[in-house]
């Protein structure tokens, strides 16, 4: 992984593109920290395991987060 101690935030670019929840392998939400002052959202896609940085401010991404949390609450007993 191209990481050095000087890298602060994970995302070089962020995407506004809608993501189909069915194509998601994993969704990581990284809270602000001493290294990176803002939230970062990283989607891991089922196809090839591609990882994509998403824009937390985008309406499409906010809808995705809602859909994913809804799905999780359905699954939990």
């Amino acid at each position: 992984i191209p990481l050095s101690r000087t890298v602060r935030c994970t995302c070089i670019s962020i995407s506004n593109q809608p993501v189909n929840p069915r194509s998601l392998e994993k969704l990581e939400i990284i809270p602000p920290s001493q290294f990176c002052p803002h939230v970062e959202i990283i989607a891991t896609m089922k196809k090839k395991g591609e990882k994509r940085c998403l824009n937390p401010e985008s309406k499409a991404i906010k809808n995705l987060l809602k859909a994913v949390s809804k799905e999780r609450s359905k699954r939990s007993p």
């Epitope: 050095s4 994970t10 591609e50 990882k51």
Partner: antibody
């Protein structure tokens, strides 16, 4: 359509300074990391510098560290390269390029939009 | 620092032929971090492939990328007249830095 336009190139004496600009249109500039890449006459491509979408990280090729500074003004959709202590070997076409949507340290989507370049000649 | 080597330096082929371009890294590179670009004389480079094998938007399917570890390949299945150009591989490495290979020129036989 997505477009990048560089400006600020010219002929400059060794040891002097120059500031390049790159103006973006057709996409949300503040969402994308940006690069400067150069190409010396008759040579291949050489990556120069990158700045994250939010300006939180900046990195440089060793040969320009301490002399060049990459910066951006998201309110003006503009990327800059401040070049100080210029040397003959900095003579090149300088391209700005957009980092692909969603790129991060775990997956790289490539430089997907390029400007046409601005020429910098360092000569006495 | 990872060094990329491209071979051959020049590839002389005729339209309709298959072109196979090689990119070798001095150390193992994750396929997630390898890209290919095309550059025609007097023009800016154009992204062809990212993630070693995914075609960029608008790139015809005659272009394909493959490989892993230290050996990567760009294949043009049937050369069209507009494909004669210089091709560069590029990797995103630690520090982080973005290194280009020296390029392979595909010219008309």
């Amino acid at each position: 359509q997505m477009q990048l336009v560089e400006s600020g190139g010219g002929v400059v004496q060794p040891g002097r300074s120059l500031r390049l600009s790159c103006t973006a249109s057709g996409f949300t500039f503040s969402n994308n990391g940006m690069h400067w890449v150069r190409q010396a006459p008759g040579k291949g491509l050489e990556w120069v510098a990158v700045i994250w979408f939010d300006g939180m990280n900046k990195f440089y090729v060793d040969s320009v560290k301490g002399r060049f500074t990459i910066s951006r003004d998201n309110s003006k959709n503009t990327l800059y390269l401040e070049m100080n202590s210029l040397r003959a070997e900095d003579t090149a076409i300088y391209y700005c390029a957009r980092e692909g949507d969603g790129s991060g340290i775990y997956y790289y989507y490539g430089m997907d939009v390029w400007g046409q370049g601005t020429t910098v000649t360092v000569s006495s | 620092e990872i060094v990329l080597t491209q071979s051959p330096g020049t590839l002389s082929l005729s339209p309709g032929e298959r072109a196979t371009l090689s990119c070798r890294a001095s150390q193992s590179v994750s396929s997630s971090y390898l890209a290919w670009y095309q550059q025609k004389p007097g023009q800016a480079p154009r992204l062809l492939i990212y993630g070693a094998s995914s075609r960029a938007t608008g790139i015809p399917d005659r272009f394909s990328g493959s490989g892993s570890g230290t050996d990567f390949t760009l294949t043009i299945s049937r050369l069209e007249p507009e494909d004669f150009a210089v091709y560069y591989c590029q990797q995103y490495g630690s520090s982080p830095i973005f290194t280009f290979g020296p390029g392979t020129k595909v010219d008309i036989k």
